[in-house]
C-alpha cells in the first residue's frame, strides 16, 4: 500500500510557510511530501476551498530505480500581486488511495503601508463656494488615520484628529492644493495632490437696460472671484424661436451664438447687428486669469419693431379726369417689424398737402375734387410699422392717361364732401 | 546538466507574427516557471512573462499584454512565445530563463539562474 | 511599476579593486532582490538572489546586501574576468524589473 494510508501518517515532510507582505508582492508557498508508488497531483486550499486555477508547478524527483520506489513531490503556488482576497490558510491536498491527506497551514498575510481606495480629485469650483473633498485607505494593519493638507500645510495637529474620509471646505478665494496622508503602524501613504481651481462665481441679474430695433444694451452684476480680478465677461445671444425650447437649464443652443466680449467694469455690453422685431435668449459668464465662471440661465429678451428702412418701390401715378389711380409695391429695404399699411400724401402746386393711410392696399384710385385742373399734382407713398412711419418716396408726378394704357383694378375711395386737397381724414 | 535553447528569431516586418521556442532540458520542466526576457540592441533587460507549465497559467507584461501569447507543451518540454501585432520597438534579442526554486516552506520573490542563448527579433 | 535605479552607469577600475555598485528602489521591496553579470553577445548570469545569498558556483568574492529601497553588490577584489555589466532585479512585484544596468570596465 502507498505509504500515508494510514490516517495518522501524514505523507507531507515540508509544510507551507507564511507571507506576509505589502499589497503587490510576488510569493511562493511550498510543501513537500514523499510517497511510494506513482506521484499523487497535488491541489492547493485556500481557507478550505481547492484552488482550481491555481499559478502552480510540481517536481516528482524518484528515490529509486523502480516506480513502486518512493517519490519526492514538490508544489510550488504562486501568489502574485498579493490583495487582500488573496489573504488566508493555504494548505496541500493529496488523494492517495482512498484517502485524503492536508497538510499543515501557511498564512498568508497583508501588512503593509496604507493603500488608497479613494483620492482626492482635481476640480473646479466658483469663489467663495463650499465643496467636499473625499479620501479612504486601508490597511492592514488597521487603523488607518487620515491627516488632511491644504498647499501641504497640516489641517490638524496629528493624524486621525481632523476630518477623515471627507473635507468640508466652506469656500476658497484662491486656487489651492489639497492632499491626504493614511497612516498606519507600518508608516505613511501620501494621495495625489489635487488642484482646486476657482473660478469666478456665475453673474447675476442679467437684464436689459435699453432696447433699440436693431441693438440691445444688457447689463448684469458680476460673482466673486477671489484674489483674481475678472479679466473680462463672454455675452451669448442666439435667435430663438417658439419651438426652439432653450429652458433655464439647457446647456447649448442649436445653432451657434453670437459671441461678444465685454472689457469689465463697467458690467454692461452693447448687442448690435441684431435682427429687429425678433426674440433671443441671451447669457453672460465671466473669466479671471484661473477661467470662467459658469454662463448663467438663458434669459429672453427681443428687439423692438423699427420703422422700414426705405420706401415703397416701383409707384406709378395715372390721372384720367378726375380720378388718379396710384400703385406700388412692397418696400424692398428691411421692414424692421410688421407691415401695417401704406400712407400716402398728394399735393398739388400751391395747395396744401393731403395725407391718406390705405391700409395694407398697394393700389388706391382718388377721386379729386374740383374740376381737375390742378396743375403739378405729386404723390409720395411710405410704409408703417407700429414703431412708425418709414421714409416717403421722392415725389411721382401724376401723368396723363391715355386710352390703351392698362388700368389697374381696384376700388374707388372717394374723398368725404369736403373741400379738394383737405387735410387728412382717417 | 540544464539546458535552454531558444529557436524562431529573425527578420519580420511591422504588424507580422513570429513563434519563439524554448527547449528546456537536465531539470523537471513542471517543477519551476519559465520567464521569457528581452533585451534592445544596446539597452537593459525587460521582463515579457512568465508561465508555470505544469498549471498552464501565464502572465504578461503589460506592453505586449494582447499581443503575445506565451504556452508550454510539457510533453516536449518546450515553451513558446507566440508574437503578434509586432512593432518596431519589439525588436530585441529574447531570452527564456528558468526561475531559480527556492527553498523552505515560502519566499517572497524569485530569480532566474539558468537562460538561454538568446534569439534575435 | 517599480522603478530600479543603479549608480554608477559605468566605473572604471583596476584588477584587485574593490568595487560597489549600488542599486534603489522606488518602493520596498523587502530582499527580493537578485543581481546578475552580463558580458557582450552573452546572456546573464545569476550571481545574487533574495539581496545577500550567494548563487552555487559564484565566487565568494561577489556579496550582496541590503533590504528595503537600497541594495549594494560587491566586488572585493576585482578579477579580469569581471569586467561586464551588472543588473540588479526586483521581483517583490509583477512585473519584475531591472535596473538600467552598471558597465565596469578596465581602468
Known amino acids: 500500500a502507498p505509504r500515508g494510508t494510514q490516517a495518522e501518517e501524514s505523507p507531507f515532510v515540508g509544510n507551507p510557510g507564511n507571507i506576509t507582505g505589502a499589497r503587490g508582492l510576488t510569493g511562493t508557498l511550498r510543501c513537500q511530501l514523499q510517497v511510494q508508488g506513482e506521484p499523487p497531483e497535488v491541489h492547493w486550499l485556500r481557507d478550505g476551498q481547492i484552488l482550481e486555477l491555481a499559478d502552480s508547478t510540481q517536481t516528482q524527483v524518484p528515490l529509486g530505480e523502480d516506480e513502486q520506489d518512493d517519490w519526492i513531490v514538490v508544489s510550488q503556488l504562486r501568489i502574485t500581486s498579493l490583495q487582500l482576497s488573496d489573504t488566508g490558510q493555504y494548505q496541500c491536498l493529496v488523494f492517495l488511495g482512498h484517502q485524503t491527506f492536508v497538510s499543515q497551514p501557511g498564512y498568508v498575510g497583508l501588512e503593509g503601508l496604507p493603500y488608497f481606495l479613494e483620492e482626492p480629485e482635481d476640480r473646479t469650483v466658483a469663489a467663495n463656494t463650499p465643496f467636499n473633498l473625499s479620501c479612504q485607505a486601508q490597511g492592514p494593519p488597521e487603523p488607518v488615520d487620515l491627516l488632511w493638507l491644504q498647499d501641504a500645510v497640516p489641517l490638524a495637529t496629528a493624524p486621525g484628529h481632523g476630518p477623515q474620509r471627507s473635507l468640508h471646505v466652506p469656500g476658497l478665494n484662491k486656487t489651492s492644493s489639497f492632499s491626504c496622508e493614511a497612516h498606519n503602524a507600518k508608516g505613511v501613504t501620501t494621495s495625489r495632490t489635487a488642484t482646486i481651481t476657482v473660478l469666478p462665481q456665475q453673474p447675476r441679474n442679467l437684464h436689459l437696460v435699453s432696447r433699440q430695433p436693431t441693438e440691445l444694451e444688457v447689463a448684469w452684476t458680476p460673482g466673486l472671484s477671489g484674489i483674481y480680478p475678472l479679466t473680462h465677461c463672454t455675452l451669448q445671444a442666439v435667435l430663438s424661436d417658439d419651438g426652439m425650447g432653450i429652458q433655464a437649464g439647457e446647456p447649448d443652443p442649436p445653432e451657434e451664438p453670437l459671441t461678444s466680449q465685454a472689457s469689465v467694469p463697467p458690467h454692461q455690453l452693447r448687442l448690435g447687428s441684431l435682427h429687429p422685431h425678433t426674440p433671443y435668449h441671451i447669457r453672460v459668464a465671466c473669466t479671471s486669469s484661473q477661467g470662467p465662471s459658469s454662463w448663467t440661465h438663458w434669459l429672453p429678451v427681443e428687439t423692438p419693431e423699427g420703422v422700414p428702412l426705405g420706401p415703397p418701390e416701383n409707384i406709378s401715378a395715372t390721372r384720367n379726369g378726375s380720378q388718379a389711380f396710384v400703385h406700388w409695391q412692397e418696400p424692398r429695404a428691411p421692414l424692421q417689424g410688421t407691415l401695417l399699411g401704406y400712407r400716402l400724401a398728394y399735393q398739388g402746386q400751391d395747395t396744401p398737402e393731403v395725407l391718406m393711410d390705405i391700409g395694407l392696399r398697394q393700389e388706391v384710385t382718388l377721386e379729386l375734387q374740383g374740376d381737375g385742373s390742378v396743375s403739378n399734382l405729386t404723390v409720395c407713398v411710405a410704409a408703417y410699422t407700429a414703431a412708425g412711419d418709414g421714409p416717403w418716396s421722392l415725389p411721382v408726378p401724376l401723368e396723363a392717361w391715355r386710352p390703351g394704357q392698362a388700368q389697374p383694378v381696384h376700388q374707388l375711395v372717394k374723398e368725404p364732401s369736403t373741400p379738394a386737397f383737405s387735410w387728412p381724414w382717417w | 546538466e540544464v539546458q535552454l535553447v531558444e529557436s524562431g528569431g529573425g527578420l519580420v516586418q511591422p504588424g507580422g507574427s513570429l513563434r519563439l521556442s524554448c527547449a528546456a532540458s537536465?531539470?523537471?520542466?513542471?517543477?519551476?516557471?519559465i520567464h521569457w526576457v528581452r533585451q534592445a540592441p544596446g539597452k537593459g533587460l525587460e521582463w515579457v512573462g512568465w508561465?508555470?507549465?505544469?498549471?498552464?497559467?501565464?502572465y504578461y507584461a503589460d506592453s505586449v499584454k494582447g499581443r503575445f501569447t506565451i504556452s508550454a507543451d510539457t510533453s516536449k518540454n518546450t515553451a513558446y512565445l507566440q508574437m503578434n501585432s509586432l512593432r518596431a520597438e519589439d525588436t530585441a534579442v529574447y531570452y527564456c530563463?528558468?526561475?531559480?526554486?527556492?527553498?523552505?516552506?515560502?519566499?517572497?520573490?524569485?530569480?532566474?539562474?539558468?537562460w538561454g542563448q538568446g534569439t534575435l527579433v | 511599476d517599480i522603478q530600479m535605479t543603479q549608480s554608477p552607469s559605468s566605473l572604471s577600475a583596476s584588477v584587485g579593486d574593490r568595487v560597489t555598485i549600488t542599486c534603489r528602489a522606488s518602493?520596498?521591496?523587502?530582499?527580493?532582490v537578485a543581481w546578475y553579470q552580463q558580458k557582450p553577445g552573452k546572456a546573464p548570469k545569476l550571481l545574487i538572489y533574495s539581496a545577500s545569498f550567494l548563487y552555487s558556483g559564484v565566487p565568494s568574492r561577489f556579496s550582496g546586501s541590503g533590504s528595503g529601497t537600497d541594495f549594494t553588490l560587491t566586488i572585493s577584489s576585482l578579477q579580469p574576468e569581471d569586467f561586464a555589466t551588472y543588473y540588479c532585479?526586483?521581483?517583490?512585484?509583477?512585473?519584475?524589473?531591472f535596473g538600467q544596468g552598471t558597465k565596469v570596465e578596465i581602468k
Open positions: 530563463a528558468r526561475e531559480y526554486s527556492g527553498w523552505g516552506g515560502s519566499s517572497v520573490g524569485y530569480a532566474m539562474d539558468y
Open positions: 508561465i508555470a507549465p505544469y498549471s498552464r497559467h501565464p
Open positions: 537536465g531539470f523537471s520542466f513542471t517543477g519551476t516557471w
Open positions: 518602493q520596498d521591496v523587502s530582499t527580493a
Open positions: 532585479q526586483q521581483s517583490y512585484t509583477t512585473p519584475p524589473t
